[in-house]
């Protein structure tokens, strides 16, 4: 369980958080997903990144840095002024996050036009768009702090980047594999179930016959199915116990004003872990 920090602690100075939950310690919860989230650190008076496990935890957890700052830093919205830079950012800096179609797990960086910062995202390993950098420095150099008045040579190079009509993207799932999503609006963070638990059983592409289990979200139970040994999706577990442990926790009851809600939520960042398929 989360502990609340003591507001009277002398190290904290006089700054009071906007909400009591901003004083709570970061709580990754008992689950094992790896979801990049942000919390307000009462000791540094800053919003910082932490890795959320995907269930339970507390309310001091935000999907974006901006949302954390707006919620927990007094006067943040008044003082947050757009950086006045005469330099033009290439158009691809404003492209939405696109993890592509593949199922790899590559750590990349993109410029987030909402937070005006370069942030980490998970790239699937193919396709996508040009708002995709190998290093944070490269992203910052090109999109956060572009150099002033580029030379004519640079202008010619940048024209290559002006438009990217490459993608029309529905980013919730790709190949039935869950991919990162950038939430557009602040929302209540209750519990987010693992999205692959909502996928249908998929026997895959090969010819083997292996006994596996999948979570049936309609019945709330794990059922047996035959897996052919390759392909398929992540709703695929070697034992019923593993299946239940991974997916059953996706349905938790949140008491809110006396009403019991059952919520399933897609996690904005999910580390996809593959059981061996070859």
């Amino acid at each position: 369980l989360s502990e609340e920090a003591d507001d009277t602690d002398s190290e904290l100075g006089s700054m009071k958080p906007l909400h009591t939950f901003c004083a709570m310690k970061a709580d990754d919860g008992p689950c094992k997903a790896m979801i990049r989230s942000y919390f307000f650190n009462m000791y540094t008076h800053q919003c910082e990144e932490f890795i959320y496990g995907g269930c339970e935890g507390n309310e001091n957890r935000f999907d974006t840095l901006e949302e954390c700052k707006k919620t927990c830093i007094p006067g943040y919205e008044k003082t947050a002024v757009k950086a006045a830079s005469g330099a033009e950012r290439p158009d691809f800096c404003f492209l939405e996050e696109d993890p592509g179609l593949c199922r790899g797990y590559m750590k990349r960086y993109l410029y987030n036009n909402q937070t005006k910062q370069c942030e980490r995202f998970v790239y699937g390993g193919c396709l996508g768009n040009r708002n995709n950098f190998e290093t944070l420095d490269e992203c910052k150099k090109i999109c956060e702090n572009p150099v002033h008045s580029p030379s004519p040579v640079n202008e010619v190079q940048m024209s290559d980047y002006v438009t990217d009509g490459n993608t029309v993207t529905d980013r919730s799932t790709v190949n039935n594999i869950v991919v990162p999503q950038s939430p557009k609006v602040p929302r209540r963070r209750d519990y987010r179930g693992r999205p692959w638990c909502l996928q249908p059983a998929d026997s895959g592409l090969c010819k083997a016959s292996e006994r596996r289990f999948y979570y049936n979200s309609a019945t709330g139970k794990c059922h047996r199915f035959n897996y052919t040994g390759c392909g398929g999706n992540n709703n695929n577990f070697t034992t019923r116990r593993r299946c239940l442990r991974s997916c059953k926790t996706g349905l938790i009851k949140n008491k809110s004003k006396g009403v019991v809600k059952i919520q399933r939520r897609k996690a904005p960042f999910v580390k996809v872990v593959y059981e061996s398929i070859n």
Epitope: D98, G100, L101, C102, R103, G104, M106, G124, G125, C126, L127, G128, N129, R130, N132, E134, D164, N166, T167, V168, T169, D170, R171, S172, T173, V174, N175, N176, D202, S203, G204, L205, C206, C230, G231, G232, N233, I277, N278
Partner: antibody, heavy 120, light 113 residues
Framework: EVQLLESGGGLVQPGGSLRLSCAAS????????MSWVRQAPGKGLEWVSA????????YYADSVKGRFTISRDNSKNTLYLQMNSLRAEDTAVYYC?????????????WGQGTMVTVSS | QSVLTQPPSVSGAPGQRVTISCTGS?????????VHWYQQLPGTAPKLLIY???NRPSGVPDRFSGSKSGTSASLAITGLQAEDEADYYC????????????FGGGTKLTVLG
């Protein structure tokens, strides 16, 4: 058995249109991204286009962007490539392939191909 | 001009070992993208031979192996057999092309004798 069967190729004049189909069987079609790859006579392979399992995300090579449209009908287990404003350099065998099925990002399984000839 | 560079041809006698190189750049192989290899026998469609730099799909003999280092990759074939005579293509993705798929120009393997 997993099978991909392309059709719709043929002879077409420059500026004309053609629609290729790829009928898939033996696997859960809607679960996989699909791609088109082409090979000009006596030449190497060239990636053309790709589409996500849901059909919500599409990608194109610069050489065909604005002229070709990839789509899929998951109820019919069929992948399509609508080719407009065809040019002589589009002459090739067109293959459909499953993308990232047993691998993470390779073209795992290929169809036998359909020949498209653009000539006046 | 292909984004990935392969030698146009290689040859070897039965039982020998041959390697085919695939040279890229910092925007493709060097950017962390996987390299895949395909075999195309005469008059047939390409077939996946090696995926993810060094993995063999089921059914591919262990005479075929792949490796990747820096901005290049290579395919090695040991114990060369007559039926290995084919075109071999490497493939990856390129960040300067919005992550588009890119292929090598292909290498024709001739088994001598």
């Amino acid at each position: 058995e997993v099978q991909l069967l392309e059709s719709g190729g043929g002879l077409v004049q420059p500026g004309g249109s053609l629609r290729l189909s790829c009928a898939a069987s033996g696997f859960t079609f809607s679960s996989y991204a699909m791609s088109w790859v082409r090979q000009a006579p006596g030449k190497g392979l060239e990636w053309v286009s790709a589409i996500s399992g849901s059909g919500g995300s599409t990608y194109y090579a610069d050489s065909v962007k604005g002229r070709f449209t990839i789509s899929r009908d998951n109820s019919k287990n069929t992948l399509y490539l609508q080719m407009n404003s065809l040019r002589a350099e589009d002459t090739a065998v067109y293959y459909c392939a499953i993308l990232g099925a047993t691998s993470l990002s390779a073209f795992d399984i290929w169809g036998q191909g359909t020949m498209v000839t653009v000539s006046s | 001009q292909s984004v990935l560079t392969q030698p146009p041809s290689v040859s070897g006698a039965p039982g020998q070992r041959v390697t085919i190189s695939c040279t890229g750049s910092s925007s493709n192989i060097g950017a962390g993208y996987d390299v895949h290899w395909y075999q195309q026998l005469p008059g047939t469609a390409p077939k996946l031979l090696i995926y993810g730099n060094s993995n063999r799909p089921s059914g591919v003999p262990d005479r075929f192996s792949g490796s990747k280092s820096g901005t290049s990759a290579s395919l090695a074939i040991t114990g060369l057999q007559a039926e290995d005579e084919a075109d071999y293509y490497c493939q990856s993705y390129d960040s300067s092309l919005s992550g588009s798929g890119v292929f090598g120009g292909g290498t024709k393997l001739t088994v001598l004798g």
